[in-house]
Each structure stands twice: as C-alpha cells, then as structure tokens.
Interface confidence: medium
C-alpha cells in the first residue's frame, strides 16, 4: 500500500549552520557572523557567547557551535559552561569572602580551589598515623598500632576543634 505523505516543513531541510529565512521564501541562509545554529531546521541563529573580561576564549564560535570560555590565569570555572570564574588560592588555603585564608590546624587543601577538609582520622579505621598531615596534605595512615614493632610510636592528631571547611576570620 502507498503511505500518505505528510506535508514536510521546508525548514527541516536547513542544516546546522544555517537558518530558515522567512523573508526569503524559507530558503536556508547561512548564519550571520557571530552567530550559530547547532541543529537543523532552526528559524533563527543564536548569538555567539563572547568571552570577555575575566573570561577568555577556549574554543572559537563557529557557524554550528557556540564559543566556549574558560577563566584567565588565577581563576577557575564554576557553573554550567563556565558561567562564573572564581579566584584561585594556593594549596593549603581556602577562599572565603575575605580572600584566601590558610587552612586551620587539622585541615588541609591539596588544590587551588575548594575548602579545607579535616585530616583523616586514622584511629577510626584502627590505624595509626604514618605521616603527619600539613595544610597542603592529608595524613597518611599506616598499620594499626598493634601491628607496629615494639617501641614504635604513633602520632594521632587531635580532632579539629571547629566545623570543617571554615577558616577563622
């Protein structure tokens, strides 16, 4: 049997990188400069994202895909599609509203972003501290105290005396 053919939207033939131009009998026109269409059949092209100020261009806009931004050195991306740039800190610090602050004793941050996290409490796993923690590094847990040879000492850090992730102001 013969299938009834539906009237096809002429715009559906317009590929990515073009738009269906109503002003020109619905022919497919290329996207103007600084605009793109990432899918076919579009009636308009979208304006390209501009990476200005703290944002810098990671990928140029093309007729079929939007520009992609990242952040200028000293900042890192946050949010979908790098919608925001946040100030970096040094390892051993966290970003507060008052700027970069050193991690409190008992906490560490091994990255340029994020918050200070408490050192691992080795004793919770029945282990001892093999290497002490620093502002930049977590403690390294070793064998349990019972496994240590006689005379060996273990260092267990005191529990942090504050809520983790917040530096004193």
């Amino acid at each position: 049997f013969e299938r009834t053919r539906s009237l096809q939207d002429p715009c559906s033939n317009c590929p990515a990188g073009t738009f269906c131009d109503n002003n020109r009998n619905q022919i497919c026109s290329p996207c103007p400069p600084n605009s793109f269409s990432s899918a076919g059949g579009q009636r308009t092209c979208d304006i390209c994202r501009q990476c200005k100020g703290v944002f810098r261009t990671r990928k140029e806009c093309s007729s079929t895909s939007n520009a992609e931004c990242d952040c200028t050195p000293g900042f890192h991306c946050l949010g979908a599609g790098c919608s925001m740039c946040e100030q970096d800190c040094k390892q051993g610090q966290e970003l507060t509203k008052k700027g970069c602050k050193d991690c409190c004793f008992g906490t560490f941050n091994d990255q340029k972003r994020g918050i200070c996290r408490p050192w691992t409490n080795c004793s919770l796993d029945g282990k001892s501290v093999l290497v002490n923690g620093t502002k930049e590094r977590d403690v390294v847990c070793g064998p349990s105290p019972a496994d240590l040879s006689p005379g060996a000492s273990s260092v267990t850090p005191p529990a942090p005396a504050r809520e983790p992730g917040h530096s004193p102001q």
């Epitope: 100020g53 703290v54 944002f55 200028t72 050195p73 000293g74 900042f75 946050l78 919608s83 925001m84 740039c85 946040e86 100030q87 040094k90 970003l95 509203k97 008052k98 700027g99 970069c100 602050k101």
Partner: antibody, heavy 122, light 107 residues
Framework: EVQLVQSGAEVKKPGASVKVSCKVS????????MHWVRQSPGKGLEWMGS????????IYAQKFQGRITMTEDTSADTAYMELSSLRSEDTAVYYC???????????????WGQGTLVTVSS | DIQMTQSPSSLSASVGDRVTITCRAS??????LNWYQQKPGKAPKLLIY???SLQSGVPSRFSGSGSGTDFTLTISSLQPEDFATYYC?????????FGQGTKVEIK
C-alpha cells in the same frame, strides 16, 4: 553591559545621616556583588564595604563599623549606602561599584557609578 | 590590613614616552593586583586585573606585570588621553586596599 547611576549631591550637618542610592541597569541587582568606595578631596580611594548576593552577606570596613548600613531594593534594582553620625572628615565623593559579571570574589571594581559628592558642614 | 605603596607619586612625561609605575604590597598578594585610571571629576576606570589581564576595551599600550609583592604598570607609548592619576589595588584579602596614586602630568 552593567551601568550604575547614583543619586545627586548632598549637603549635611555634622551628626546627621546620608543615604546614597545606586541604580543598576543592564543586569539585575541579584546577579551582582556591590561595593562602596569613597574618595575624600585630594585624597586616595578607600573601600567601605561589600555586599555578596550568593548568600546575602555584607562586609564592612572596620573603620565604618556601626556607622554604615548597606541595603538593597531588588525590586527596584537599587543599592543604598547609609552613613550616620557624619563629621566633617566624611566629606567625600562616594562611589558604588560592582565586579565584572560572572566573577566570584574577584574583588576588583568595574564598572563604577558616577559618584555622589557628600559635603558635611555646619 | 595590607598596605600598598606606589612610586613615584607623580611624574612628568611627553606624548610617546614609555611610562612605568610601580606598586609594592606590604605582604605577598600573589597576582591579586588591579590597576585603575582616574581623570579629574570622573570615576576610576579598571585597566588591568589579576596583575596582567587587560580589561575589555583598554588599549594594548597598557600592560601589567609582577607577582608577590612587586608590580608594574607600563604605558608603552603615552597618548594625550593617558594623562591622569593611576591607582593600584590589592584584591587578595579584605579589606581591599589602594595605593596612594601616581599622577601622570604633561612635561
């Protein structure tokens, strides 16, 4: 493009209060952190305080603690800075400024309002 | 608070000159240093942020360098519209603090 337009010049007597407004256009106030900076005649620039919209926290310079109040009317996209117990040394141009859109705690100032001259004189 | 010291406090130069202004922080501020230009009766204008990043729309004759405690603003070829006062500002910690300014005058 963010634009900031401030209220007009004020003349106040010592002991009085002044409230300076800063109207935002181009973006909504809730998208921007807002800072206030003043400049005394022939002097340099002095940060007074900042408002961060992510969690509504306001930070004031120690020097102005107890005398400064920063508020926002988000429905009108307008920020306010009120300074009380005015003295002659508070005579200055007061600026509102924001950070580049999309910047979290970059703590640089751009763009700025045009400034509001506050004169404190008996 | 972190103190910012600019030098010189004023300088005289001619159109076309290369001009250098320095800014020193009282402690290390990494690269969190910004430069502003201010003309009489106008609000400051951001030129450089994060020590060396040129703000959109600012001419490329302006450049910034430095990290830690010592920073430099350079105008490679001074133009008539560049005669103004320049301020550095640290954004490393609160309170943000400014240098006292450098006035660039016509020789």
């Amino acid at each position: 493009e963010v634009q900031l337009v401030q209220s007009g010049a004020e003349v106040k007597k010592p002991g009085a209060s002044v409230k300076v407004s800063c109207k935002v256009s181009g973006y909504t106030l809730t998208e921007l952190s807002m800072h206030w900076v003043r400049q005394s005649p022939g002097k340099g620039l002095e940060w007074m305080g900042s408002f961060y919209p992510e969690d509504g926290e306001t930070i004031y310079a120690q020097k102005f603690q107890g005398r400064i109040t920063m508020t926002e009317d988000t429905s009108a996209d307008t920020a306010y800075m009120e300074l009380s117990s005015l003295r002659s040394e508070d005579t200055a141009v007061y600026y509102c400024a924001t950070e580049g859109v999309g910047v979290i705690r970059g703590n640089w100032f751009d763009p700025w309002g045009q400034g509001t001259l506050v004169t404190v004189s008996s | 608070d972190i103190q910012m010291t600019q030098s010189p406090s004023s300088l005289s130069a001619s159109v076309g000159d290369r001009v250098t202004i320095t800014c020193r922080a009282s402690q290390s501020i990494s690269s969190y240093l910004n430069w502003y230009q201010q003309k009489p009766g106008k609000a400051p204008k951001l030129l450089i942020y994060a020590a060396s990043s040129l703000q959109s729309g600012v001419p490329s004759r302006f450049s910034g360098s430095g990290s830690g405690t010592d920073f430099t603003l350079t105008i490679s070829s001074l133009q008539p519209e560049d005669f103004a006062t320049y301020y550095c500002q640290q954004s490393y910690s609160t309170p943000p603090t400014f240098g006292q300014g450098t006035k660039v005058e016509i020789k």
